[in-house]
Every structure is written in structure tokens, then in C-alpha cells.
């Protein structure tokens, strides 16, 4: 892989330990927490990133802010089990033997159970809706300019193929970015929409995962875009299996097929 040879760091993942002990003395980087080798020419999987984040000592986790804990059921931040490819294992369990099934972006898609809970397959999240509210700006944003800039961002910064950015909607001050990627559409080497969405989510919270880069500076014809609030909805190829109590009781649901993380930005 192409980690920077001169100082042996991973441009796409600061949560790594790198050393020149690869084949032929090449720089090799391993994710914190899992120790898995990562490809520094592309995004690291969300599972490995979450694992790295949870492995950091509590007092060293300077990126975590109180808003992190405003996630429904506190499911957004946990120490996941990842498979050898770095993907989420379909079943996740905590230290007290409470288990649940997750989708490909690691979001819980069933009620919590015990060790007897079966999760037959990792269900793919094929549609992600990123809902943003931007701060009032001195100059208005033109929809087509905003669309072009966000598509450029996902293509250049997150290396997501343009065909997976399905749409950008804008009704001031709300911006919606739709990412779509079916199993059949995702070719080898394609960045996963779940990973791109996670990098974007961290970027807009000022917690960039990229090595040595400053905060994300997003401009539309020179006018900076600042994000006040983010809401991310995940739609799975197979509907989730929650009890009726959860679906009707005002839990996290934005409809039975949606999971959402609710983050506040101040």
C-alpha cells in the first residue's frame, strides 16, 4: 500500500501505528485496537475506526465531546467485533453477554438479546441519507454550486465513486446528501458508502480522521459552509427486526426501515 514513505504515516487514518517493517522495508500501518493492517491509499473501514477509537485511553480520547453520548440507546459508540476484512460482524455482544444484530454500518437493527441471539448475515445498508442544517451565512448558497461542491468533496476527499452520490437536496438551511450503493453495484476497490459517510460525519464534527490535515474547509464559491446539526438515516436492504413496542414507542425510528444517529453541533 502507499503509506507515506518519508515519515511512514497513514494519510487516510491517524488512528494507526506505522513502521517500515513491510515487505522490502516498506511502511506498514496497523489500526489501533485491532492491530489489523490497513490500506492507506483508501478509507479505513468504520468497524476498525470504531475499534481504534474505543481502544484509546479514556484520558487520551481528546476527540470525544459530550454530544457523542446523545446517540439513541448510546449505540453509536461501542467496541465492535470486526471480521478479517475489517467489516462489522453481524452479531455484536458486550461484556455482559448482551447481544444484538447490526447492519453493514454497525448500527443496531434488532432488539437486544442474549448469547443465543442469531444474526444469520450482515445486512447491507444500501441507502444513507445525511441531513445537515447549515449555519446562517452572509451569502446565500446556489443549489447547483452546492451540489457540485459536495459531489467534489465525496469524490476527492473520500474517494467515493460519483455514481454512489445519488442526490443533493437543498432547502435553506437544510442540505440532504443521498448515498446509494447496492451489493451488486459495489465493485472490488470501491469505497463503501458507510465508510464515506462515517469519515464525513467525523469531518463535520471537527474530528477529522485524516492524518495531519486541518479541519474540513467546505466552500461554495468561496462562501464557507458551517454545519450546525447532523442527522444520519440508514436504510437497509432487508428491513430491521424491532419489536412493535420500539416501532411505536417513539424510540429512535424515523420509520421502521430507518435507523438514525442524532448528533448536535454547537
Amino acid at each position: 500500500h502507499t503509506a507515506a514513505q518519508d515519515n511512514c504515516t497513514c494519510p487516510t487514518n491517524k488512528m494507526t501505528v506505522c513502521s517500515p517493517d513491510g515487505p522490502g522495508g516498506r511502511c506498514q500501518c496497523r489500526a489501533l485496537g485491532s492491530g489489523m493492517a490497513v490500506d492507506c491509499s483508501t478509507l479505513t473501514s468504520k468497524c476498525l475506526l470504531l475499534k481504534a477509537r474505543m481502544s484509546a485511553p479514556k484520558n487520551a480520547r481528546t476527540l470525544v465531546r459530550p454530544s457523542e453520548h446523545a446517540l439513541v440507546d448510546n449505540d453509536g459508540l461501542y467496541d465492535p467485533d470486526c471480521d478479517p476484512e475489517g467489516r462489522f460482524k453481524a452479531r455484536q455482544c458486550n461484556q455482559t453477554s448482551v447481544c444484538w444484530c447490526v447492519n453493514s454500518v454497525g448500527v443496531r437493527r434488532t432488539d437486544k438479546g442474549d448469547l443465543s441471539l442469531r444474526c444469520d448475515e450482515l445486512v447491507r445498508t444500501h441507502h444513507i441519507l445525511i441531513d445537515l442544517r447549515h449555519r446562517p451565512t452572509a451569502g446565500a448558497f446556489n443549489h447547483s454550486d452546492l451540489d457540485a461542491e459536495l459531489r467534489r468533496l465525496f469524490r476527492e476527499r473520500y474517494r467515493l465513486h460519483p455514481k454512489f452520490v445519488a442526490a443533493v437536496h437543498y432547502e435553506q438551511p437544510t442540505i440532504q446528501i443521498e448515498l446509494r450503493q447496492n451489493t451488486s453495484q459495489k465493485a472490488a476497490g470501491d469505497v463503501d458508502i458507510g465508510d464515506a459517510a462515517y469519515y464525513f460525519e467525523r469531518d463535520i464534527k471537527g474530528e477529522s480522521l485524516f492524518q495531519g490535515r486541518g479541519g474540513l474547509d467546505l466552500r461554495v464559491r468561496g462562501e464557507p459552509l458551517q454545519v450546525e446539526r447532523t442527522l444520519i438515516y440508514y436504510l437497509d436492504e432487508i428491513p430491521p427486526k424491532f419489536s412493535m413496542k420500539r416501532l411505536t414507542g417513539g424510540g429512535s425510528g424515523g420509520g421502521s426501515h430507518h435507523h438514525h444517529h442524532h448528533h448536535h453541533h454547537h
Partner: antibody
Framework: QVQLVQSGAEVKKPGASVKVSCKAS????????INWVRQRPGQGLEWMGW????????KYNEKFKGRVTMTVDTSTSTVYMELSSLRSEDTAVYYC???????????????WGQGTLVTVSS | EIVLTQSPATLSLSPGERATLSCSAS?????IYWYQRKPGQAPRLLIY???NLASGIPARFSGSGSGTDYTLTISSLEPEDFAVYYC?????????FGQGTKVEIK
């Protein structure tokens, strides 16, 4: 450290033009816009406009539209502000200032250049 | 255009005293920025986004407010704090500054 260095003082006749330069260093030049602000003797601060070096986008104060032109030379990390049809009321200290912004915050104008005194006198 | 009115125009205080500077906007703004200017020097950013301290600025400076009324407070004046202070808005074009408050030694 981030630094903006401006060109020296100028004396101009009414009706002439002046071009002030602002050379940036210590940061990625294309990542922040450069604003121009002037201060007339005994007056407050007056914003003239900004230019964003990455794509050349600019925004001018309507008050100066038609008289002000901001340009950028990315090869030398320099921004220029040209003011034409000068009159005595344009006698002022002209400052360039960097505005750093991310998706999280607008961090204001910081730092400022040392200022360039432009005197318009017949 | 949004007009920012600063008060008082001049504030005469002694070192160690608390200084409270006001900035009133002609229409609601979301954030205010504060700058300090000393004679013969360029302005210096003190506060961004209403209440955040700029890099290298001492903690005795603080900002607050919302809507149309904003305040810069210097908890205990140091000799180097005697200067002119300006507020600025980034809510709508043209960007505007207040006319300034001069903090002078009593």
C-alpha cells in the same frame, strides 16, 4: 507562523489607481480567504471585500464595486487589492486579513497584515 | 446593512478593574467577533463566534450575547489592555464593524 506582509506606503493623486499587495506565509495559501479592510483617519474599520485563492471567488462591498479589484497570484502566495478613481476620502490605512473557516466554525479575521498607508493628495 | 453600535464610546478605568463593552446590532445576528487595536498596530482578533477565545488570548477576555446584544468583558484590566475594541458581524453583506470603544486609563 501565519503571517501577512503588505507592500509599502503610497502617495497618489486624485483620479489615479493604487495597487496594494499582501504576501501570505505559514499556512496553505489556497485554504483561506483574504479580506481587505481600511481605516480612514479618525474613523472606524470598513470592510472592502474578500477573495478566495483556491478558485478566485470574490465578494466586494457594494460601496466599492466598480472601483475595487482583488486578484491573486498563487505562485507567490500574494493577493492584490487595486482601488481606482482615487479621491481624498480614500486616504486610509489598508489592511489585508486572513479569514480561516472550517465546517465547524468561522474563526474570524486573524492575522492581519501590518497595514499600508495610502495618501491621496493633489 | 447591519449597523453595529458600541457603547460606551470611551471607558475610563484603572488597572485591575472590570471592563464591560457593549455591541448592539440594528438587526439580529448569529455571532459577533471582537478585535483589539492599539495605536500604530494592526487589529488583533480576541473573540470569534461570540464567546470563543482566539489563540493566544488571555482568559481574562470573554464574550457573550445573542440576537442584537453582545458583550465583551475584561475581568481584570492589565496595562496592555488599554486600547480600542471593535465588534464585527458576519451575518450579512456588507460585513460591518462597530465604531469602537476606547478603553483608557483613568
Amino acid at each position: 507562523q501565519v503571517q501577512l506582509v503588505q507592500s509599502g506606503a503610497e502617495v497618489k493623486k486624485p483620479g489615479a489607481s493604487v495597487k496594494v499587495s499582501c504576501k501570505a506565509s505559514g499556512y496553505t495559501f489556497t485554504s483561506s480567504d483574504i479580506n481587505w479592510v481600511r481605516q480612514r483617519p479618525g474613523q472606524g474599520l470598513e470592510w472592502m471585500g474578500w477573495i478566495y485563492p483556491r478558485d478566485g471567488s470574490k465578494k466586494y462591498n457594494e460601496k466599492f464595486k466598480g472601483r475595487v479589484t482583488m486578484t491573486v497570484d498563487t505562485s507567490t502566495s500574494t493577493v492584490y487589492m487595486e482601488l481606482s478613481s482615487l479621491r481624498s476620502e480614500d486616504t486610509a490605512v489598508y489592511y489585508c486579513a486572513r479569514r480561516f473557516a472550517t465546517v465547524v466554525s468561522n474563526y474570524g479575521l486573524d492575522p492581519w497584515g501590518q497595514g499600508t498607508l495610502v495618501t491621496v493628495s493633489s | 446593512e447591519i449597523v453595529l453600535t458600541q457603547s460606551p464610546a470611551t471607558l475610563s478605568l484603572s488597572p485591575g478593574e472590570r471592563a464591560t463593552l457593549s455591541c448592539s446590532a440594528s438587526s439580529s445576528v448569529n455571532y459577533i467577533y471582537w478585535y483589539q487595536r492599539k495605536p500604530g498596530q494592526a487589529p488583533r482578533l480576541l473573540i470569534y463566534d461570540t464567546s470563543n477565545l482566539a489563540s493566544g488570548i488571555p482568559a481574562r477576555f470573554s464574550g457573550s450575547g445573542s440576537g442584537t446584544d453582545y458583550t465583551l468583558t475584561i475581568s481584570s484590566l492589565e496595562p496592555e489592555d488599554f486600547a480600542v475594541y471593535y465588534c464585527q458581524q458576519w451575518n450579512s453583506y456588507p460585513l460591518t464593524f462597530g465604531q469602537g470603544t476606547k478603553v483608557e486609563i483613568k
